[in-house]
């Protein structure tokens, strides 16, 4: 006998996630073809600086990989070029377009991408794995107080449905590798570790694969033991920025602190031609500090709108608690509007114009 009953739980309105990025496009190319991906600006407006990403890693231009703000070309494509491609806004990392690309061994014949002449699980509906919500996969560092629970997720899709496996520090990770075990939910693409301890620190990688390709994501877990310390600032933040005159800029600062942190954004200034005072303390002006209605989340971002040449310079995120202070700095370079910026680095290519 099966019995059923119902109870209700009432929740308040919560933040609604931002709009879904454009529909995932699945594209099939033949070996040796030129892969061309186009990402026009939404609503026809200005594009702003963009970056092209494959399987979570920024694409670096080369003789074979041609990167533009609205277009990506991969010449003489091979099987290794299969994967999930996305075009993102450089500053916000918002996904503007994303594509699942599969490169088949046979050159494409142009018309018959309906797959009638291919094996039964190939064609437009088949393809290498891709992240279903790539914009949610940007955060990679998780700092958690000991004794709490951690969940890593890598939701993905592909055809055939990909499998998922997990590595810790590059090695296969199984339940017997930790006291308390782990909980895997393959249908939720998740790994759960209850009551984490310092020995759980490390790099956790999900590997999602099917016969057409493989994608992976690595998360870093830090388990915080509760000895009081000054705030910890995430490495690499805020990051140096280069912006075009009149554009908008965001600096980010991620603060970890047991005791309630106090966060300030400072801009370094000159007084009578000097950057530091008689005692060696830098001259600064406070741009943003905690107010009655300011949340820590809001304080972790400094937004500069319609930047001018006067906005160029050094910016500092300063975080303090009852134990002490920590600070990280970054530089803003402002370029003239007519100058086209072409910057290639490990994070990919940036265009502004």
């Amino acid at each position: 006998e099966s019995l059923g009953t119902e109870q209700r739980v009432v929740g308040r309105a919560a933040e609604v996630p931002g709009p879904e990025p454009g529909q995932q496009e699945q594209l099939v190319f033949g070996s040796g073809d030129a892969v061309e991906l186009s990402c026009p600006p939404p609503g026809g407006g200005p594009m702003g600086p963009t970056v092209w990403v494959k399987d979570g890693t920024g694409l670096v231009p080369s003789e074979r990989v041609l990167v533009g703000p609205q277009r990506l070309q991969v010449l003489n494509a091979s099987h290794e070029d299969s994967g999930a491609y996305s075009c993102r806004q450089r500053l916000t990392q918002r996904v503007l377009c994303h594509f699942s690309v599969r490169v088949t061994d046979a050159p494409s014949s142009g018309d018959d991408e309906d797959g009638e002449d291919e094996a039964e699980d190939t064609g437009v509906d088949t393809g290498a794995p891709y992240w279903t919500r790539p914009e949610r996969m940007d955060k990679k560092l998780l700092a958690v107080p000991a004794a709490n629970t951690v969940r890593f997720r890598c939701p993905a899709a592909g055809n055939p449905t990909p499998s998922i496996s997990w590595l810790k520090n590059g090695r296969e990770f199984r339940g017997e590798h930790r006291i308390g075990g782990i909980k895997l939910r393959h249908q939720q693409w998740s790994l759960v570790m209850e009551s984490v301890v310092p020995s759980d620190r490390g790099n956790y990688t999900c590997v999602v694969e099917n016969k057409f390709g493989s994608i992976r994501q690595t998360y870093t877990l830090d388990v915080l033991e509760r000895s009081p310390h000054r705030p910890i600032l995430q490495a690499g933040l805020p990051a140096n920025q280069t912006a075009v005159l009149g554009s908008d800029v965001e600096f980010h600062c991620k603060v970890y602190s047991d005791a309630q942190p106090h966060i300030q954004w400072l801009k370094h200034v000159e007084v009578n031609g000097s950057k530091v005072g008689p005692d060696g303390t830098p001259y600064v002006t406070v741009l943003k500090t905690a107010g009655a209605n300011t949340t820590d989340k809001e304080l972790e971002v400094l937004s500069l709108h319609n930047v001018t040449f006067e906005d160029a310079g050094e910016y500092t995120c300063l975080a303090g608690n009852s134990i002490g202070f920590s600070h990280h700095s970054a530089w803003l370079v402002v370029l003239p509007a007519e100058e086209e910026l072409v910057e290639a680095d490990e994070a990919g290519s940036v265009y502004a114009g």
Epitope: R12, A14, F152
Partner: antibody
């Protein structure tokens, strides 16, 4: 063994005050939170509020905001619920519960779970 | 309320008034006792809880299933969402002996 023991309940007149204590043992008090949940006689569970002892951050239900205060003494591994301006509708068994977070980079919320509960202490507000 | 006999399969449902993702826990409470955690994150069995208990659902509709009712399972069961603050409980479902 994880244990939570509430004390301080009793009979109080409307408008009066009472302070409940929750003594914790068997776990790292400063790594997790403490929630207070109450249950009126014959009724369901109602969340009152919670504290994270390491940074003192607190949250409260609307029904008690401004009247109840949660605090913690980490040196004593004890959390407190200070109840002022008590009303008849505050009559209930009050439970404290260890509360841990489920940290997940993929979502924009932290889920909080109450895994160990005390035995409860009865507060009666009556004239 | 629901009533059943030993060995029965019991399903208790919980509906949220808005999307709460999978941030739902289930608790069991016996008369005069404190609640006990059974399930968290909609479907994860808490350590030490018998495997006859299972949870499922996401969004607004959630289910707690007892695959084979045992005498010690007669109790009141509460769902609770923690997607938003304040967390809220369902009104409870009492499982009684038929």
């Amino acid at each position: 063994e994880v244990q939570l023991v509430e004390s301080g309940g009793g009979l109080v007149q409307p408008g009066g005050s009472l302070r409940l204590s929750c003594a914790a043992s068997g776990f790292t008090f400063t790594s997790t939170g403490i929630s207070w949940v109450r249950q009126a006689p014959g009724k369901g569970l109602e969340w009152v509020g919670r504290i994270y002892p390491t940074n003192g951050s607190t949250n409260y239900a609307d029904s008690v905001k401004g009247r109840f205060t949660i605090s913690a003494d980490t040196s004593k591994n004890t959390a407190y619920l200070q109840m002022n301006s008590l009303r008849a509708e505050d009559t209930a068994v009050y439970y404290c519960a260890r509360t841990y977070g489920i940290y997940d980079l993929y979502v924009d919320y932290t889920e909080y779970v109450m895994d160990y509960w005390g035995q409860g202490t009865l507060v009666t507000v009556s004239s | 309320e629901a009533s059943g006999g030993s060995g029965d399969r019991v399903t208790i449902t919980c509906r949220a008034s808005q999307d709460v993702s999978t941030a739902v826990a289930w608790y069991q409470q016996k008369p005069g006792k404190a609640p006990k955690l059974l399930i968290y994150s909609a479907s994860f069995l808490y350590s030490g809880v018998p495997s006859r208990f299972s949870g499922s659902g996401s969004g607004t509709d959630f289910t707690l299933t007892i695959s084979s009712l045992q005498p010690e399972d007669f109790a009141t069961y509460y769902c609770q969402q923690s997607y938003t603050t304040p967390p809220t409980f369902g009104q409870g479902t009492k499982v009684e002996i038929k």
